[in-house]
């Protein structure tokens, strides 16, 4: 699986999850998030050669098409597969609110 | 929606579904498919600016991060959203077989 455990160890050049630390204030301008100050959102990148973690029959077909027709610009793309939530603390006036934001952390990638 | 109806009419530069005709024999080397000879598989391409058909909270966050940090190479990617099957005819010896291949045709795209 193209997950953090594999990708962060092996630094694979093809489609893999990459670490990306996002500081809410500095990187997004979100001053309203009190805690955490930032988090590892991660992202997916890298080429998707034929059959690499193909998501659907279409991505398999497109990968083969791209291999046999390399001048074509049609190829699968490396995108998130498994995502996890992030719990944040923010304030409404002086009242603290805890909320779980879904799909905030990329744990693995696929070629789609 | 970034579907064939919209994208094939407007020729949008940002993330959209693009027409792609694949000839089974010529483009894939698949001589075993008897009918159809080819089909419109289509594919997704184009930049994913902030908030364009964002798939998850993560793609929204990543789109904003990329807008504010354009030198970073971390941005969402344009990939298939809705796919449809394709029915094919092939032969096993002299026996005709009809099979429905799932997820063969891209009908719309999203930024993931």
């Amino acid at each position: 699986a193209l997950d953090t455990n594999y990708c962060f160890r092996n630094l694979e050049e093809n489609c893999c999850v990459r670490p990306l630390y996002i500081d809410f204030r500095q990187d997004l301008g979100w001053k309203w998030v009190h805690e955490p100050k930032g988090y590892y959102a991660n992202f997916c990148s890298g080429p998707c050669p034929y059959l690499r973690s193909a998501d659907t029959t279409h991505s398999t077909v497109l990968g083969l098409y791209n291999t046999l027709n390399p001048e074509a610009s049609a190829s699968p793309c490396c995108v998130p597969q498994d995502l996890e939530p992030l719990t944040i603390l923010y304030y409404v006036g002086r009242t603290p609110k805890v909320e779980q934001l879904s799909n905030m952390v990329v744990k693995s990638c696929k070629c789609s | 929606a970034l579907d064939t109806n919209y994208c094939f009419r407007n020729l949008e530069e940002n993330c959209c579904v693009r027409p792609l005709y694949i000839d089974f024999r010529q483009d894939l080397g698949w001589k075993w498919v008897h009918e159809p000879k080819g089909y419109y598989a289509n594919f997704c391409s184009g930049p994913c600016p902030y908030l364009r058909s964002a798939d998850t909270t993560h793609s929204t966050v990543l789109g904003l991060y990329n807008t504010l940090n354009p030198e970073a190479s971390a941005s969402p990617c344009c990939v298939p959203q809705d796919l449809e099957p394709l029915t094919i005819l092939y032969y096993v010896g002299r026996t005709p077989k009809v099979e429905q291949l799932s997820n063969m045709v891209v009908k719309s795209c999203k930024c993931s």
């Epitope: 962060f8 160890r9 092996n10 630094l11 670490p19 630390y21 | 030198e71 971390a74």
Partner: nanobody, 119 residues
Framework: QLQLVESGGGLVQPGGSLTLSCAAS????????MSWVRQAPGKGLEWVSV????????IYSDSVKGRFAIARDNAKNTLYLQMNSLKPEDTAVYYC????????????RGQGTQVTVSS
Amino acid sequence: QLQLVESGGGLVQPGGSLTLSCAASGFTFSHYPMSWVRQAPGKGLEWVSVIGSDGGTKIYSDSVKGRFAIARDNAKNTLYLQMNSLKPEDTAVYYCAEGDSRYVRGRTRGQGTQVTVSS
């Protein structure tokens, strides 16, 4: 909050050696790859090296390959860069970076440490 503190820079003669250190805190250091980047006077950030989370995979830019060695001590939350056969063109401010700086450019969190190679 994620913090990175670089140290070990200084003035060294061509052909000399230095070892840079980076103390990391505010995140699970052992889970993530780490990188070194540098910024020469009047130039942009240049990726130097990256090391995998367990220290097994190490990749170097062509400009430092064979001269620099990246290492990490996950027990101490510390990243290192052993710099040998230093050249004047290695003069720069060196920063450690969380993650793999081949993919995410233009972002430094620490103050950096100045390395000057001059006779």
